[in-house]
């Protein structure tokens, strides 16, 4: 049931996530994790914000939008096949067990093969279907039609092991509706 987003190896991937702050600057904590949203918190956290700022991030993961206006969309720089999988955006609004949780599926495709112009005729003669294009999901990309999709082994996450007991840290608090206030 996750929404699917696509990118090619070497590109930046974009995973959208938004909320509406009750008032300008009235921010709530958000965490991004690799793996579907567990019952509590984020598993395998890659980026985290608090009420004021981004307070934790790992290399290649950043917020490109204006997170102070509720744009907490994640950008992953220079993706590889290993970046494929489910990501959790968790909006942690104060309260009891009211997190807004969004699971987004990132599919990474191999980079397009761009043949050298002088070899074009030979290339297309040998591979007549190579220039077929196919559209994919929310972020449409072009792929080489005759190449099989890479069958990626799903990266194991905490997602399927909904934790009965939470980690004792401050980010398990809460969270609520996407519109705050």
């Amino acid at each position: 049931s996750e929404v699917e987003y696509r990118a090619e190896v070497g590109q930046n991937a974009y995973l959208p996530c938004f909320y509406t702050p009750a008032a300008p600057g009235n921010l709530v904590p958000v965490c991004w994790g690799k793996g579907a949203c567990p019952v509590f918190e984020c598993g395998n956290v890659v980026l985290r914000t608090d009420e004021r700022d981004v307070n934790y991030w790992t290399s290649r993961y950043w917020l490109n939008g204006d997170f102070r206006k509720g744009d907490v969309s994640l950008t992953i720089e220079n993706v590889t096949l290993a970046d494929s999988g489910i990501y959790c955006c968790r909006i942690q609004i104060p309260g009891i067990m009211n997190d807004e949780k969004f699971n987004l599926k990132l599919v990474i495709k191999p980079a397009k093969v761009t043949p050298a112009p002088t070899r074009q005729r030979d290339f297309t003669a040998a591979f007549p279907r190579m220039l077929t294009t196919r559209g994919h999901g929310p972020a449409e990309t072009q792929t080489l039609g005759s190449l099989p999709d890479i069958n990626l082994t799903q990266i194991s996450t905490l997602a399927n092991e909904l934790r009965d007991s939470r980690l004792a840290n401050d980010l398990r608090d809460s969270g609520a509706t996407i519109r705050i206030g």
């Epitope: 309260g95 997190d99 807004e100 949780k101 699971n103 398990r172 809460s174 969270g175 609520a176």
Partner: antibody, heavy 113, light 107 residues
Framework: EVQLVESGGGLVQPGGSLRLSCAAS????????INWVRQAPGKGLVWIGW????????KYTPSLKDQATLSTDKAKNTAYLQMNSLRAEDTAVYFC??????WGQGTLVTVSS | DIQMTQSPSSLSASVGDRVTITCKAS??????LGWFQQKPGKAPKTLIY???RLVDGVPSRFSGSGSGQDYTFTISSLQPEDIATYYC?????????FGQGTKLEIK
């Protein structure tokens, strides 16, 4: 505005079954937890279980695990509690809640012959 | 399962009094404790979450404190509209468990 409206309560024979509905509105149904809680007449609150509509994950209180089943219909923004093998002691008001901050009004289930 | 022992089960106080209710968990719940107010025929209403954080819109006369296994809920100056039953809840782990409730009455 977040709203939860329960329905489906009423009189049930011992040994019977009942499916309660919880219609949600005013928020993104698939992204928030739903909890079910019940309260027998004159008694305290008892947590029944939890479901995340986004992926259908569930948790139950051990004493009701074999009797209660939680589910959702994302197209209808509705959560369901199915209760089987009902006994007199299952007579209670049943509440659904978005997280545990927004509650429905409750629906009364009476188990009696 | 985590047991929540709430006391007293009932209490009678006068308008303006300071009222205190306690909840003890059978193990450390890392301050993942909420307090609810329930009036007859109504759904519970969240007052406090994370042991000491007041829900927006709840009067400041309500407060919570505690850590580990021991938690306290206080009404600094009892008002007539505070007559209700109060429950604690631990949400540190499943199954979630409520205290038995404290019925508050006016003298």
């Amino acid at each position: 505005e977040v709203q939860l409206v329960e329905s489906g309560g009423g009189l049930v024979q011992p040994g019977g079954s009942l499916r309660l509905s919880c219609a949600a509105s005013g928020y993104t149904f698939t992204s928030s937890d739903i909890n079910w809680v019940r309260q027998a007449p004159g008694k305290g609150l008892v947590w029944i279980g939890w479901i995340f509509p986004g992926d259908g994950s569930t948790k139950y209180t051990p004493s009701l695990k074999d009797q209660a089943t939680l589910s959702t219909d994302k197209a209808k923004n509705t959560a369901y509690l199915q209760m089987n093998s009902l006994r007199a002691e299952d007579t209670a008001v049943y509440f659904c809640a978005r997280g545990l901050d927004y509650w429905g009004q409750g629906t009364l289930v009476t188990v009696s012959s | 399962d985590i047991q929540m022992t709430q006391s007293p089960s009932s209490l009678s106080a006068s308008v303006g009094d300071r009222v205190t209710i306690t909840c003890k968990a059978s193990q450390d719940i890392n301050s993942y404790l909420g307090w609810f107010q329930q009036k007859p025929g109504k759904a519970p209403k969240t007052l406090i979450y994370r042991a000491d954080r007041l829900v927006d819109g709840v009067p400041s006369r309500f407060s919570g404190s505690g850590s580990g296994q021991d938690y306290t809920f206080t009404i600094s100056s009892l008002q007539p509209e505070d007559i209700a039953t109060y429950y604690c809840l631990q949400y540190d782990e499943f199954p979630l468990t409520f205290g038995q409730g404290t019925k508050l009455e006016i003298k």
